[in-house]
């Protein structure tokens, strides 16, 4: 059967006026997954995102990530979109550095 991913969105300071937002999906099976950043609901182009490889995490499941750099103050426009085994979800950027969003999807 399939195991839905845990999705975790974090943010970190990149440079003055910019932040890097990273969306991590972990503990999912099978390995096929769509993970992409969207702005106003529209997927960012590939050249503005960085993807990690889909790697085994040692538990028979997989993990991956996608990151992009955005302007501070525009966080509300961005969501991480995840699609896995016919299920999908969108995940907002947390409002502060200490905030992480963890969601398990079934």
């Amino acid at each position: 059967g399939s195991v839905p991913p845990m999705v975790n969105v974090t943010r970190s300071e990149a440079s003055e006026g910019n932040i890097t937002v990273t969306c991590r999906a972990s503990s999912f099976y099978p390995r096929n997954i769509t993970l992409t950043w969207r702005q106003d609901g529209v997927s960012l182009s590939h050249d503005t995102q960085q993807w990690g490889d889909v790697l085994p995490d040692g538990n028979g499941t997989y993990q991956t990530w996608v990151a992009t750099r955005i302007c501070q103050g525009e966080e509300q426009r961005f969501t991480c979109y995840m699609e896995h085994s016919g299920n999908h979800s969108t995940h907002p950027v947390p409002s502060g550095n200490s905030h992480h969003h963890h969601h398990h999807h079934h």
Epitope: R38, Q39, D40, G41, V42, S43, L44, S45, T48, E74, Q76, R77, T79, Y81, E83, H88, S89, T90, H91, P92
Partner: antibody
Framework: EVQLVQSGAEVKKPGASVKVSCKAS????????IYWVRQAPGQGLEWIGY????????IYNQQFKDRVTITADTSTSTAYLELSSLRSEDTAVYYC???????????WGQGTLVTVSS | EIVLTQSPATLSLSPGERATLSCSAS???????LHWYQQKPGQAPRLLIY???NLASGIPARFSGSGSGTDFTLTISSLEPEDFAVYYC?????????FGQGTKVEIK
């Protein structure tokens, strides 16, 4: 086939409110944003706002923020636009549209004409 | 707010002629965020070109787009009767999302 079907034309008096619906089909409703755009007679297109039905996030054009409410009912795959304190200059065709993979508006509803007249 | 100015307001041409429509932005826009739509009377707009130069599904190859920064162009290489319509550019780079005022391509 992706379809966005809007409610019928409305005639309202100044000061009243109107609620326009947009029923989506042919795709997973919560996977795309729904935008609202209006077009006054003989004029151009004006973006009102959008909703992400999955997380319920709404972004408004500041120009409309005080009088507009955008909502969505995921159980019926329907988005709504409510405009209050109507005035004659709100007479327009109101469109709903879906956020595309690569563009902001890839599928459109047929439009709903709202006429504000005393 | 990014203001998009389209020119000319009206373009009078004959079938078979080449149409060149311009869209000028008040601030620089990434080419990823500039799109074109076609609208015929009594109909909703239809996505024509996305991200400056990519044809939307089902759009014939006589349509093309180009540009960068603040200046973008939609070209129709040889006008067909069904191409006479109003064309709008739109930017998705910054809020509020904005459209140009439109260029009407009419039969001469």
């Amino acid at each position: 086939e992706v379809q966005l079907v809007q409610s019928g034309a409305e005639v309202k008096k100044p000061g009243a409110s109107v609620k326009v619906s947009c029923k989506a089909s042919g795709y997973a409703f919560t996977s795309n944003n729904i935008y609202w755009v209006r077009q006054a007679p003989g004029q151009g297109l004006e973006w009102i706002g959008y909703i992400d039905p999955y997380i319920g996030r709404i972004i408004y054009n500041q120009q409309f923020k005080d009088r507009v409410t955008i909502t969505a009912d995921t159980s019926t795959s329907t988005a709504y636009l409510e405009l209050s304190s109507l005035r004659s200059e709100d007479t327009a065709v109101y469109y709903c549209s879906r956020s595309g993979e690569r563009s902001n508006f890839d599928y459109w509803g047929q439009g709903t004409l709202v006429t504000v007249s005393s | 707010e990014i203001v998009l100015t389209q020119s000319p307001a009206t373009l009078s041409l004959s079938p078979g002629e080449r149409a060149t429509l311009s869209c000028s932005a008040s601030s620089s826009i990434s080419s990823n965020y500039l799109h074109w739509y076609q609208q015929k009377p009594g109909q909703a707009p239809r996505l024509l070109i996305y991200r400056t130069s990519n044809l939307a599904s089902g759009i014939p190859a006589r349509f093309s787009g180009s540009g960068s920064g603040t200046d973008f162009t939609l070209t129709i290489s040889s006008l067909e009767p069904e191409d006479f319509a109003v064309y709008y550019c739109q930017q998705g780079g910054s809020l509020p999302l904005t459209f140009g005022q439109g260029t009407k391509v009419e039969i001469k």
